[in-house]
């Protein structure tokens, strides 16, 4: 015997209280597949979340984050605070990158500057809190007579100690 509920399309539910007839999903609920015995409550995008796509009778609402925050997790399940370039997010809020580290994005952690000498190269441009160092050619790559400009050692910035 065929289940009468299998005829209920998406956007409806099989109403046991009404002889298993297909009833439309109530407001603020949806069913994305046929044959459902209940409709699911629509996701509410409020506070740190904002609505990217409204809920319909056949699909859930989709959220993104209010400006100043960015999405984390599948389907934007969480919103995380943005920081400025040159900072990283800690439980104490946004903190400047420590000396010798950088972050060129509004999210993520501060990463150590590239160690040019590991590749046998010299520092062409000093690093900052926002930018990695730029490595230049190795001394051996410089043609004889070419002027090699050695940049001054970077002045120590008042970096924060690690969290």
């Amino acid at each position: 015997l065929q289940d009468p509920c299998s005829n209920c399309p998406a956007g409806t539910f099989c109403d046991n209280n009404r002889n298993q007839i297909c009833s439309p999903c109530p407001p603020n609920s949806f069913s994305s597949a046929g044959g459902q015995r209940t409709c699911d409550i629509c996701r509410q995008c409020k506070g740190v979340f904002r609505t990217r796509k409204e809920c319909s009778s056949t699909s859930n609402a989709e959220c993104d984050c209010t400006p100043g925050f960015h999405c984390l997790g599948a389907g934007c399940s969480m919103c995380e605070q943005d920081c400025k370039q040159g900072q990283e997010l800690t439980k104490k809020g946004c903190k400047d990158c420590c000396f010798g580290t950088f972050n060129d994005q509004k999210r993520g952690i501060c990463r150590p500057w590239t160690n040019c000498s590991l590749d046998g190269k010299s520092v062409l441009v000093n690093g900052t809190k926002e930018r990695d160092v730029v490595c230049g050619p190795s001394p051996a790559d410089l043609s004889p007579g070419a002027s090699s400009v050695t940049p001054p050692a970077p002045a120590r910035e008042p970096g924060h100690s690690p969290q």
């Epitope: 506070g47 984390l72 919103c79 995380e80 605070q81 997010l89 800690t90």
Partner: nanobody, 123 residues
Framework: QVQLVESGGGLVKPGGSLRLSCAAT?????NYWMNWVRQAPGKGLEW???????????YYVDSVKGRFTISRDNAKNSLYLQMSSLRAEDTAVYFC????????????????SGQGTTVTVSS
């Protein structure tokens, strides 16, 4: 259903005080870091303060340090923000928000927040 409901906002004169409350339902508050964030008119969302599960750790954005105090009463499933020496620039909608699973370890993401309560500081 997991829900946060803020209350306590209103109109206050510069230098005045307000206490915001946030009632949590549908989950056990004591299992989570909790936060206050705010959105000033025409601006993006700004993190204000957070507090760990037992209240032993509390952190604030620089602009409110010494003026705002975050606290919690886990027995009442409630979060609070005591605001004093209020300034015009504190005018905003204030939201309480729950730190998601793994907050402070893997991420600082917020997974539930309320509708907000409006604080207006004006003479």
């Amino acid at each position: 259903q997991v829900q946060l409901v803020e209350s306590g906002g209103g109109l206050v004169k510069p230098g005045g005080s307000l206490r915001l409350s946030c009632a949590a339902t549908g989950f056990t508050l004591s299992n989570y870091w909790m936060n206050w964030v705010r959105q000033a008119p025409g601006k993006g969302l700004e993190w204000v303060a957070n507090i760990n599960q037992d209240g032993s750790e509390r952190y604030y954005v620089d602009s409110v340090k010494g003026r705002f105090t975050i606290s919690r009463d886990n027995a009442k499933n409630s979060l609070y923000l005591q605001m004093s020496s209020l300034r015009a620039e504190d005018t905003a909608v204030y939201f309480c928000a729950r730190g998601g699973e793994g907050y402070g370890v893997d991420h600082y993401g917020l997974d539930v927040s309320g509708q907000g309560t409006t604080v207006t500081v004006s003479s």
